[in-house]
Amino acid sequence: IPPHVQKSVNNDMIVTDNNGAVKFPQLCKFCDVRFSTCDNQKSCMSNCSITSICEKPQEVCVAVWRKNDENITLETVCHDPKLPYHDFILEDAASPKCIMKEKKKPGETFFMCSCSSDECNDNIIFSEEYNTSNPD
């Protein structure tokens, strides 16, 4: 950290690497919950026009796809991978791509992904081939 930038006590807004350089935050699609037409596709774009600077440097991009009897929604947010989201751990937070994984939720189909490259939750991937064979 430059000497003229104060490091405040117990504040998680400043994250540094081993050299003391300040890491900057992720840029993520952040439209919260929106209705979606994404269904039965290998991948979808979020159609979210808002790219936001995540509040904290440790946050990553998250997308949540939900389908029930009435509608389909896509949620795009920033979230700290140390904390559960919708009661699930973000196990793939270090991935550069947002590869959807199904989670058990009663009464709906629920997929979630997380990733850590800029705007990576803009392109959500359902296709199994990405999970196994894609080198990226």
Partner: nanobody, 124 residues
Framework: EVQLLESGGGLVQPGGSLRLSCAAS???????RMWWVRQAPGKGLEWVS?????????YYAKSVFGRFTISRDNSKNTLYLQMNSLRAEDTAVYYC?????????????????WGQGTLVTVSS
């Protein structure tokens, strides 16, 4: 030698406007994504806004979205931040910073150079 020199801070009333500038030298300005970062007294850093080196794509924190506008003039190696509808909570030292470029911008990237900052005080 890399230098980032901010200016334009000052005392302004709530609802007022200010325009900050950051004059850059010592590096190829058009290769770097540039940021405005602020630090309120006794608080941590808040990443306010960023702009791509080419194409002028811009990003904002939710706290300033719709009120602040970042821009750059690559011919003058200068970064700007137009701040409108200022609030007391915008009071802070504002820094410009350049981001280390890479093949892809990722969460592992970091700031390598900072300016000395310019103080913005919003008070009646």
């Amino acid at each position: 030698e890399v230098q980032l020199l901010e200016s334009g801070g000052g005392l302004v009333q709530p609802g007022g406007s200010l325009r900050l500038s950051c004059a850059a030298s010592g590096f190829t300005f058009t290769e770097y994504r540039m940021w405005w970062v602020r630090q309120a007294p006794g608080k941590g850093l808040e990443w306010v806004s960023a702009i791509e080196p080419i194409g002028n794509r811009t990003y904002y924190a939710k706290s300033v979205f719709g009120r602040f506008t970042i821009s750059r003039d690559n011919s003058k190696n200068t970064l700007y931040l137009q701040m409108n509808s200022l609030r007391a909570e915008d009071t802070a030292v504002y820094y410009c910073a350049k981001q280390i470029p890479g093949r892809k911008w990722t969460a592992n990237s970091r700031f390598d150079y900072w300016g000395q900052g310019t103080l913005v005080t919003v008070s009646s």
